[in-house]
Amino acid sequence: LRPSRVHNSEENTMRALTLKDILNGTFSYKTFFPNWISGQEYLHQSADNNIVLYNIETGQSYTILSNRTMKSVNASNYGLSPDRQFVYLESDYSKLWRYSYTATYYIYDLSNGEFVRGNELPRPIQYLCWSPVGSKLAYVYQNNIYLKQRPGDPPFQITFNGRENKIFNGIPDWVYEEEMLATKYALWWSPNGKFLAYAEFNDTDIPVIAYSYYGDEQYPRTINIPYPKAGAKNPVVRIFIIDTTYPAYVGPQEVPVPAMIASSDYYFSWLTWVTDERVCLQWLKRVQNVSVLSICDFREDWQTWDCPKTQEHIEESRTGWAGGFFVSTPVFSYDAISYYKIFSDKDGYKHIHYIKDTVENAIQITSGKWEAINIFRVTQDSLFYSSNEFEEYPGRRNIYRISIGSYPPSKKCVTCHLRKERCQYYTASFSDYAKYYALVCYGPGIPISTLHDGRTDQEIKILEENKELENALKNIQLPKEEIKKLEVDEITLWYKMILPPQFDRSKKYPLLIQVYGGPCSQSVRSVFAVNWISYLASKEGMVIALVDGRGTAFQGDKLLYAVYRKLGVYEVEDQITAVRKFIEMGFIDEKRIAIWGWSYGGYVSSLALASGTGLFKCGIAVAPVSSWEYYASVYTERFMGLPTKDDNLEHYKNSTVMARAEYFRNVDYLLIHGTADDNVHFQNSAQIAKALVNAQVDFQAMWYSDQNHGLSGLSTNHLYTHMTHFLKQCFSLSD
């Protein structure tokens, strides 16, 4: 029996969400992030596509670039030079991997209203950016870096060894882009544009993943990507710095790698300029529990970069890997030598520390059984950061200000009481010197973006309040959401439960578990979403639950590092434990329980289905990892070590989905993957399918030709429609 949905006449006028609503993005929200260009000005693309400059102090708007100019080159993006004399216009966007894309760039001269002719940029360009001061340009073309002193000048070629899939200059290779830098670029201007630092990645010895791209031609193309899987040869990285004022004078100078890092395989993890003549590099051992932060100074006499051992700061984890998902980056203070950084305190919670001389003498700035998550800005007198301290909900984010000019430092929560019911999950964007800032609230209510005075925290104006969305939702029966916790064997399992609109505890509902569960992830967040699972609760009467188990983030190292070197064990156990607790609540139909997940979630859902508990009737894995030997070295080894006999090969072998093929016999399994997945290769699902066939286990499968890990475009519609049919069939819900 399905619970009746209509109780009174008012609700008769309301309707449930439809799958079409979700696929059409009918209830998507907008955010407003100012494109700051000074302490009190930002750029914004207006609804009619003009580029408008807004001055907060005068309240004036200026159209600095018309939609006509944008349209003349089909521009989809722009960038104003810091001297405000030029704008680059980006068109012909062509996506590559998660962050990377190529594009055509045109330079528009704002002083004469014309495009710069002569010495035009080549196409397509892999990355382009202005210097932080003036209007120098650095760009990457065909894996080499070029410099222009002015947009109309001929380019100066900085590197010459760039080669497709072999040597990458100023841009990351696949694994650095996805798993280390999380950017499309690997070059960094010094604060005043005197120097340009860049990374060179040598992928010559990396094994290549090859897959077919079917396209429309008679013969498929083969895509080749140097992709180091666990235990394979990794990219060799070098960092260089060139003086952009006299680039031909001494040429690029290599920055030395700390000796303790260079003694074995290592990674470069980030670069932070401190001043024009001081730079901070972070390095990481291949076994990612030791990180070294190295502060280097320019030596005028030798025209080289010196990184004294006294300016090396070591961060080591004895219980897991270094950092959270990534090792945190430093935020330097005005003395240009001391800095603020988030790392684990003695109690195993990630907190802000102030490092003046050595890490051992670090002064702890925040403390408690919660975590500091991001340092947004440090000014002369304030430090702005986000944390999940408020009311002890790990899935919230509030913005705090600590006064660092006074002693003892005082702390103020900027956001905790602004719109308490509507807004519990914030991020922020600061102008120069934190004169003003924008707050973007993601929920749990309808998202809202506001502008604030950096001195008083006073709200100046609403930038985006999603009024249209609010009106559109007025006649929709949205599901109810609750965030609560389960205490099990000294472990706290936070969960979010999405309940049908007329939820009645005395009735029984089918349960769908949505899982991700990857290390340092968080699914239970106080954010707004109207998505597929909202529809399943609203229209199909399902209860959906998300559970953050061991390995998830922002609740201390004990929970986070519990999965170290044994992925695929506790994440699965904790989902199962939670399901048992949900059954005990009395409103779950224990014969109709399903689990689904994507990527890491596909791995966990597969293992949960194959756990032999009999709890799950069916489940779906989208683009799952099936063996850690198939996934990227940087990610996998961070959590699993190496797949070698003397390290952790045994658990690599024990944690595969294929090893559990027999256990799928008593569940309905839907396996889905894109054939052009550059991230979690189709190989993963191919091997699951092979193991199931070999074990003579029936299952359902769907591939998406030429689709990557995101299954975007028309595939998205097909995917969610297909999964909906599968679940409705599993739960015996009529179509």
Partner: antibody, heavy 119, light 107 residues
Framework: QVQLQESGPGLVKPSETLSLTCTVS????????INWIRQPPGKGLEWIGL???????NYNPSLKSRVTISKDTSKSQFSLKLSSVTAADTAVYYC?????????????WGQGTLVTVSS | DIQMTQSPSSLSASVGDRVTITCKAS??????VAWYQQKPGKAPKLLIY???YRYTGVPSRFSGSGSGTDFTFTISSLQPEDIATYYC?????????FGGGTKVEIK
């Protein structure tokens, strides 16, 4: 090309109101503010005030009680009115463009018009 | 109002000389300082804005630097056509204020 042209009477009697017009061309009025600057003979430059793109005004406190700046966007014209003039208001008056692309500095100047206050 | 104190009020230099003019603001104006050149009987022309940015078409011998309260304007190699009066101006806040000017002559 960008042009700013001041016009108005070259002679104004004391206690009367000085009225000048600035006609602009060659640029979009949504991009720039218009400032009025004056320079007494043989002396330095003095900022009188401005009118923002949005129509708001800001005046030099030393002249605020006597100044009005306005605009007629349809005609691309800006006007300056300075009441109760005295001989001290004798100066070359410039209409000047300013805006965010030069951090509100003054990038294009009219050629200026000399206004003499005398009976 | 922010006072802009410019020095020297006049200077005499030879062709090819390096000429430096300074301007001191009575309070912090960040980098919001512009420099103008005015030739006799003509309107001023913008040379430098935001302390160090050379305006379009301005020869590279003209440069500016500074931030906060102290600013410098330099002509690296004086040319005969550079004979003029130079003014600094703060464009940080209203009322915009100018320095008293520096008259540059050829020896």
């Amino acid at each position: 090309q960008v042009q700013l042209q001041e016009s108005g009477p070259g002679l104004v009697k004391p206690s009367e109101t000085l009225s000048l017009t600035c006609t602009v061309s060659g640029f979009s009025l949504t991009n720039y503010d218009i400032n009025w600057i004056r320079q007494p003979p043989g002396k330095g430059l003095e900022w009188i005030g401005l009118i923002w793109t949005g129509g708001g005004t800001n005046y030099n406190p030393s002249l605020k009680s006597r100044v009005t700046i306005s605009k007629d966007t349809s005609k691309s014209q800006f006007s300056l009115k300075l009441s109760s003039v005295t001989a001290a208001d004798t100066a070359v008056y410039y209409c000047v463009r300013g805006g965010p692309l030069v951090w509100y500095a003054l990038d294009y100047w009219g050629q200026g018009t000399l206004v003499t206050v005398s009976s | 109002d922010i006072q802009m104190t410019q020095s020297p009020s006049s200077l005499s230099a030879s062709v090819g000389d390096r000429v430096t003019i300074t301007c001191k603001a009575s309070q912090d104006v960040s980098t919001a300082v512009a420099w103008y050149q005015q030739k006799p009987g003509k309107a001023p022309k913008l040379l430098i804005y935001s302390a160090s940015y050379r305006y379009t078409g301005v020869p590279s011998r003209f440069s500016g630097s500074g931030s906060g309260t102290d600013f410098t304007f330099t002509i690296s190699s004086l040319q005969p056509e550079d004979i003029a009066t130079y003014y600094c101006q703060q464009h940080y806040s209203n009322p915009r204020t100018f320095g008293g000017g520096t008259k540059v002559e050829i020896k």
